[in-house]
């Protein structure tokens, strides 16, 4: 039995997968920040987790997915105020009793040191210094991501 938040996450991810392929993104849109091969948008306003998920989807992006500790640290370095929390694309799957990214993969326990409980209706937020489990209904800011398309170097034949 999936929770309403899991259903919302799956529905949005599926609708994103159904959309037609768009041309690759070479530069970050206005107001987005580049972090390596991603464009990040740090919201100014606040929302519960599922509204944040939906908002990123309407922007043809997704809630932030963090690959490893290194990416976490680089993302946290972009957060200017240490008191602010941001939703990312990770929530607790009640059916699988594990933290699950919105792309369907599970959290590698070594990647993030989560403060708080792993339980139903828990979603993950990050601050400048930490990673927290919060009630998904909490209204905080969020981070959307778009993947940049890597530009392959052109190889010119010898002249």
């Amino acid at each position: 039995q999936k929770s309403s938040i899991e259903k919302c996450s799956v529905d949005i991810q599926q609708s994103r997968n159904k959309t037609t392929e768009r041309p690759g993104l070479l530069n970050c849109p206005i107001y987005w920040q580049q972090l390596r091969e991603k464009c990040l948008l740090f919201s100014h306003t606040v929302n519960p987790w599922n509204n944040s998920l939906a908002d990123c989807s309407t922007k043809e992006s997704s809630l932030l997915l963090i690959r490893d500790k290194d990416e976490l640290i680089h993302t946290q370095n972009l957060i200017r105020d240490k008191a602010i929390l941001f939703w990312i694309g990770l929530n607790f799957s009640l059916s699988e009793k594990n933290w699950k990214w919105i792309n369907g993969s599970f959290l590698n326990s070594n990647d993030l040191e989560i403060r708080g409980d792993a339980k139903e209706n828990s979603c993950i937020s990050i601050s400048q210094t930490s990673v927290y489990s919060e009630y998904c209904s909490t209204e905080i800011r969020w981070i959307c991501q778009k993947e940049l398309t890597p530009v392959r170097n052109k190889v010119y034949p010898d002249s």
Epitope: T45, A54, R80
Partner: antibody, heavy 117, light 110 residues
């Protein structure tokens, strides 16, 4: 270039509902929030509220009980409804692009709405 | 009554600098780095000039600059020109997805 065009009746009777539409051209309506702002003659600006294409809305607390906003993504239109209007609601109404919910980077030219019987 | 307080008027001669203040509280200007400024010529829509306290959108001359100290934000126009004569409005995020404006300042170029 992003362009916003407000439309609707220029005259509304007291106690009736003011209805305005803003048509967006030159950019995707989906990637941004959209706000309505008004300005009574000779006075300052007042933020009315914003709508997200995901369906969420945020309203100025002082107007919240009378305001409804929505988005029609297929028509690239944002609508404003303000109920139970009085003469105090007479103003130029602007729609504006609200990229992050904290500032307004593109504005329509505005539409004057007069509340009078 | 506007949530943010601006002086009703300001003036300066061509080439001079003028600073317009915008005073709020710790719940708006002082609490967030989300102050923006708009220029409005008579009969026209407001024009976006500054966001996030001091960032300038493309196309806005670098004569316009923004700053903030405590609960007060400021817009400085240096090298004043005749076309700068207009009304200027500040705005700030005020928490819980709310936005407030100042009452406006009429800038006169003498």
């Amino acid at each position: 270039q992003v362009q916003l065009q407000e439309s609707g009746p220029g005259l509304v009777k007291p106690s009736e509902t003011l209805s305005l539409t803003c048509t967006v051209s030159g950019d995707s309506i989906n990637s941004y929030y959209w706000s309505w702002i008004r300005q009574p003659a000779g006075k300052g600006l007042e933020w009315i509220g914003r709508t997200y294409t995901s369906g969420s809305t945020n309203y100025n607390p002082s107007l919240k009980s009378r305001v409804t906003m929505s988005v029609d993504t297929s028509k690239k239109q944002i609508s404003l409804k303000l109920s139970s209007v009085t003469a105090a609601d007479t103003a130029v109404y602007y729609c504006a692009r609200d990229p992050l919910g904290t500032f307004f980077d593109y504005w329509g030219q505005g539409i004057l709405v007069t509340v009078s019987s | 009554q506007s949530a943010l307080t601006q002086p009703p008027s300001a003036s300066g001669s061509p080439g001079q600098s003028v600073t317009i203040s915008c005073t709020g509280t710790s719940s708006d200007v002082g609490g967030y780095n989300y102050v923006s400024w708009y220029q409005q010529h008579p009969g026209k829509a407001p024009k976006f000039m500054i966001y996030e306290v001091s960032k300038r959108p493309s196309g806005v001359p670098d004569r316009f600059s923004g700053s903030k100290s405590g609960n007060t934000a400021s817009l400085t126009v240096s090298g004043l020109q005749a076309e700068d004569e207009a009304d200027y409005y500040c705005s700030s995020y005020a928490g819980i997805n709310n936005v407030v404006f100042g009452g406006g300042t009429k800038l006169t170029v003498l």
